[in-house]
Structures are given as C-alpha cells and as structure tokens.
C-alpha cells in the first residue's frame, strides 16, 4: 500500500448535455514528485483535458479549488458538457524528469455518458 | 452544523414510483466537494448504497438499481430528491440520504434520520 | 463489485470488556477508502472512523481503526453500556460504494 495508486473511483458518471460533470481522481501518496493530467482516451490519439503543471483549461476547474481540503484530491469537473465530451478519461499520474516528465501512473477510466438536455 | 432531512410517502404501491427528496439545511448543497447520496436499509437487514449527485448535475447510480433509479438536484431549494421506478416489495427499506466528502479520506457524515417507505397494496 | 465481510455476526460481551471487530475486503481497499459506523435500533448510521484509523469529531477515543490491504479492525477498549449496537465497514475505493454485512455487539 506504500507505493502510489491513483484512484478512479467511478466506472461509470452521467451527466445532463449542458451541465458540469465531475470526475473524481485521488492518489494514496505524494511521492514521486511530479504532476497530474487528465486525458480523454487512451494511447497515442488521446486528447488532453488537464494538466496540473500548465496551459489554460477553461472549462475545467479543480475540486480541490472549492473545498481546500486536502492534496490527494484530483477530482475536476468540466463544464457545459455536450455529446462529444463523451468517452472514458483517466487521471494519470506523471514523474518530474528533465526535460521532460514522464508517465508513472494511470487510473482505471472513468466512462462519461452525456444524456439529452431536459426539456 | 448541516442536517439532513429526508420526506415523502411512507406508502407505494407496486409497480409505481418511489419519491423521495432530501433537504440539506444549515449549508449549501451547492458547496464543492460535497457528494449527495440515497443509502436503504431493508427491515432488520445491512446497508445498501443507491447512487450519488454532485451539486452540478453528475450522477453515479449502484448498477445494481441503476435502471430504475434517477437521483436529481434542485440547488434553489437546497434539496436532491430520488425517484425509484416499478417498485416492488422488495423494495420495502428505510431509506436514507447522507453527504459524502469532501476530498480524501472519505465519509458519510451527516445523514438524515432515515424514512421508512413501505410497497405494498 | 468490492464484497466486505464482516465477522463475527454477534458479539457477547460485557461493560468494560474489551471489543475486537473485523472488517475483510474481497481486493485490497487503500485505508484513505475505508470508514466504520455505528447504528443504534431506530436511529440513522453514525460516522466512528474514517481513513480507517482517523477518529470522527466528538468520537470517544476508547474506539480505534486499524488495518490496511483486505483486513481492517475496529476496537473498543472498553465498552460503555451506550456502546452495544451494530457496527458497520463500508468502501469508497471502487463504486458501488458497498458496506460490511455488520457486527452486532451485544450485552451478555
């Protein structure tokens, strides 16, 4: 249990088309230094939701911004949710290296399901 | 501190809808972090989780229930409410809302008092 | 989905005696994920322990959490007439979100 897992605790979050969905992330330690990203997909394709260290994710914002609690919260809601937010993302955990960092470890995925607005 | 208070029919018939809503006083159900759950108990039985919202819309059911279940939150009136379809008597429990969070380590604190919904005709 | 087993069923015991209760998980739950309850007859679940061996508030310290991987311990050290109820483990590392069967601790 010494060493980090990353914790997606949810197989599966459904969301309305046009609200916020949140998808819930947590590590068990802060070692090894180093940050947290957010993906949609897997593999090569998979596209960057957010990333921890830097850029500008404006429909993204950090639970732990809100409740201040603790750091082993990397839970982020993503905001005005449409159809094509649909698909499963993962947390991953990366290692500081230089230059660059690399990937240590990737939750389990979360699968999004976006439902029709209701009328 | 923030309580919890669950209401609705105590009687359903079968094959109907089972409604129950949850009022959260002394805070905000808008407050981040927080995750809102429905958890029954059948008579003289354990605990079963039904599913969870977050203030802004997301929900997780237990699959288990997940067909039938549709949990949703009105944030004006500091409630989220749980609707349970084509109930059967199986479906007899106290049922239960509570809040989870925030953050990690994770809990279940406060809970409401619990109502017991009997199916039956 | 994670099945917790909670053992014994009942537990005979007397004021001042001490309480041992366990709680196993069918895979292994990170201690952040793990929390113990108490039920009286009649009355809503009450928060003991969190992060497996943290206290909840007002929470007397004669109860203590311990464990980690699949085995998980909840102990009273010495038990108070206002201790015999029901106690429960319950999981937040993979949903469902699912609890222990329960301990029944009773007055012998």
């Known amino acids: 249990e010494d060493e980090l897992q990353v914790i997606q605790p949810e197989k599966s979050v459904s969301v309305a088309a046009g609200e916020s969905a949140t998808l819930r992330c947590a590590m068990t330690s802060l070692i090894p230094v180093g940050p947290i990203m957010w993906f949609r997909g897997a593999g090569a394709g998979r596209e960057l939701i957010y990333n921890q260290k830097e850029g500008h994710f404006p429909r993204v914002t950090t639970v732990s911004e809100l409740t201040k609690r603790n750091n082993l919260d990397f839970s982020i809601s993503i905001s005005n949710i449409t159809p094509a937010d649909a698909g499963t993302y993962y947390c991953v955990k990366f290692r500081k290296g230089s230059p660059d960092d690399v990937e240590f470890k990737s939750g389990a995925g979360t699968e999004l399901s976006v439902r029709a607005k209701p009328s | 501190q923030v309580q919890l208070q669950e209401s609705g029919p105590g009687l359903v018939k079968p094959s109907q809808t089972l409604s129950l809503t949850c009022t959260v006083s002394?805070?905000?159900?808008?407050?981040?972090?927080?995750?809102w759950s429905w958890i029954r108990q059948h008579p003289g039985k354990g605990l079963e989780w039904i599913g969870y919202i977050y203030y802004s819309g997301s929900t997780v059911y237990n699959p288990s229930l997940k067909s039938r279940v549709t949990i949703s939150v009105d944030t004006s009136k500091n409630q989220f409410s749980l609707k349970l379809s084509s109930v059967t008597a199986a479906d007899t429990a106290v049922y239960y809302c509570?809040?989870?969070?925030?953050?990690?380590?994770?809990?279940?604190?406060?809970w409401g008092q619990g109502t017991l919904v009997t199916v039956s005709s | 989905e994670i099945v917790l087993t909670q053992s014994p069923g009942t537990l005979s015991l007397s004021p001042g005696e001490r309480a041992t209760l366990s709680c196993r998980a069918s895979?292994?739950?990170?201690?952040?994920?793990l929390a113990w309850y108490q039920q009286k007859p009649g009355q809503a679940p009450r928060l003991l322990i969190y992060g497996a061996s943290s206290r909840a508030t007002g929470i007397p310290d004669r109860f203590s959490g311990s464990g980690s991987g699949t085995d998980f311990t909840l102990t009273i050290s010495r038990l108070e007439p206002e201790d015999f109820a029901v106690y429960y483990c319950q999981q937040f590392l993979s949903s469902p979100w699912t609890f222990g069967g329960g301990t029944k601790v009773e007055n012998q």
């Open positions: 002394g805070g905000s159900i808008s407050s981040g972090g927080y995750y």
């Open positions: 509570a809040r989870e969070g925030p953050g990690y380590p994770s809990y279940f604190d406060p």
């Open positions: 895979q292994s739950v990170s201690s952040s994920f």
